[in-house]
């Protein structure tokens, strides 16, 4: 008789999840010599321990604490780049500007990026069929709690000038319900962070509007100012040129506005 299994609304665990996490860990430690001491088997065991045999709607930050301990890493606090709804460009940027870091440039962020995972209460099985959806099922699911935990701690670590890349093509350029809007903004430490600088990335080539005047950006400015952090905003009218100029800042065309 086939065992009854909870059906959730979201996609199931990414196929070959254990192998993927382990392989990513090994690759990361090879690329980053300062992390070569990391025992990737222990990292996987701690990751697995956070959600295996636990109800996938009952996950807590504490469940991920053993993994957090193993992911200890130096991140220059004044070189942090946050992003919202524009991950690819943010990652392209830090691949060129190697001294800046998104969360996914850290070991823990790199391990989990674009993956889904969940288990089942009282069994050691990984659920490859379905996992809880944040809206339709529950918010305290393994993936959401992981990202909330690491995002909060990443924001708490930031200092001086913190940058955030925002998608100017979205109806809500700043979305209070995004991870940036709901977690990171509220965990920047006013005693450490002087300024949040938003980079609003334009989508259309002919778009010359000042998106820093967008109502949602004004909302962000208000939230940040109330937290005693200064706010500044820049339009990035040409993201392709922006990246090119990060690669080649001496290029003569890079003195004009991008």
């Amino acid at each position: 008789v086939p065992r009854w299994r909870q059906q959730w609304s979201g996609p199931g665990t990414t196929k070959r999840f254990p192998e993927t996490v382990l392989a990513r860990c090994v690759k990361y430690t090879e690329i980053h010599p300062e992390m070569r001491h990391v025992d990737c088997q222990s990292v996987w065991d701690a990751f697995k321990g956070a959600f295996i045999s636990k109800h996938p709607c009952n996950i807590t930050e504490e469940d991920y604490q053993p993994l957090m301990k193993l992911g200890t890493q130096t991140v220059p606090c004044n070189k942090i780049l946050l992003w919202s709804r524009i991950k690819d460009l943010a990652h392209q940027f830090t691949q060129v500007q190697r001294d800046m870091f998104t969360l996914e440039d850290t070991l823990l962020g790199y391990l989990a990026d674009d993956l889904t995972w969940c288990g089942e209460f009282n069994t050691s099985k990984i659920n490859y069929q379905s996992c809880p959806d944040w809206r339709k099922d529950c918010s305290n699911n393994p993936v959401s709690v992981f990202w909330k935990t690491v995002s909060r701690r990443f924001a708490e670590a930031a200092c001086d000038v913190v940058h955030v890349m925002l998608n100017g093509s979205r109806s809500k350029i700043f979305d209070k319900n995004s991870t940036f809007g709901s977690v990171e903004v509220h965990n920047l430490q006013p005693e450490k962070v002087q300024t949040l600088e938003a980079w609003v990335i334009h989508g259309g080539r002919e778009d010359s509007r000042d998106l820093c005047q967008d109502p949602t950006i004004k909302e962000l400015e208000s939230i940040i100012s109330k937290r005693n952090i200064q706010f500044s905003c820049k339009n990035i009218y040409r993201p392709d040129k922006f990246l090119q100029c990060v690669k080649n800042p001496e290029d003569s065309s890079c003195t004009s506005e991008i």
């Epitope: 193993l70 992911g71 890493q73 701690r153 450490k192």
Partner: nanobody
Framework: EVQVLESGGGLVQPGESLRLSCAVS????????MSWVRQAPGKGLEWVSG????????DYADSVKGRFTISRDNSKNTLYLQMNSLRAEDTAVYYC??????????RGQGTLVTVSS
């Protein structure tokens, strides 16, 4: 600007004790959780212990549990690490840092602890 100054390191024999201190300035000390992290020669950064802003909650790496005790004196803006039953594998530069990790940007020079017979 956040500034930290670690002290108390030295050369001891296995089984002996040391007490590290970290004087902090530049922010409201009691508002921040704090951690001790260490870096052994040729190794990466290892989280050792953390303490909440009030001092009411503490946590330790498995490798030091039962031997090390973290504490703080918020009136003196100082963080402590009492290290007992020291082992050769505890040899490292010890840093204090704000937050509980896993992301650290330690500001001090650290204090070197060498455990050797």
């Amino acid at each position: 600007e956040v500034q930290v100054l670690e002290s108390g390191g030295g050369l001891v024999q296995p089984g002996e004790s040391l007490r590290l201190s970290c004087a902090v300035s530049g922010f409201t000390f009691s508002n921040f959780a704090m951690s001790w992290v260490r870096q052994a020669p040729g190794k990466g950064l290892e989280w050792v212990s953390g303490i909440s802003g009030s001092g009411g909650s503490t946590d330790y790496a498995d490798s030091v549990k039962g031997r090390f005790t973290i504490s703080r004196d918020n009136s003196k803006n100082t963080l402590y690490l009492q290290m007992n039953s020291l082992r050769a594998e505890d040899t490292a530069v010890y840093y204090c840092a704000d937050g509980t990790g896993p992301f650290f940007d330690y500001r001090g020079q650290g204090t070197l602890v060498t455990v050797s017979s």
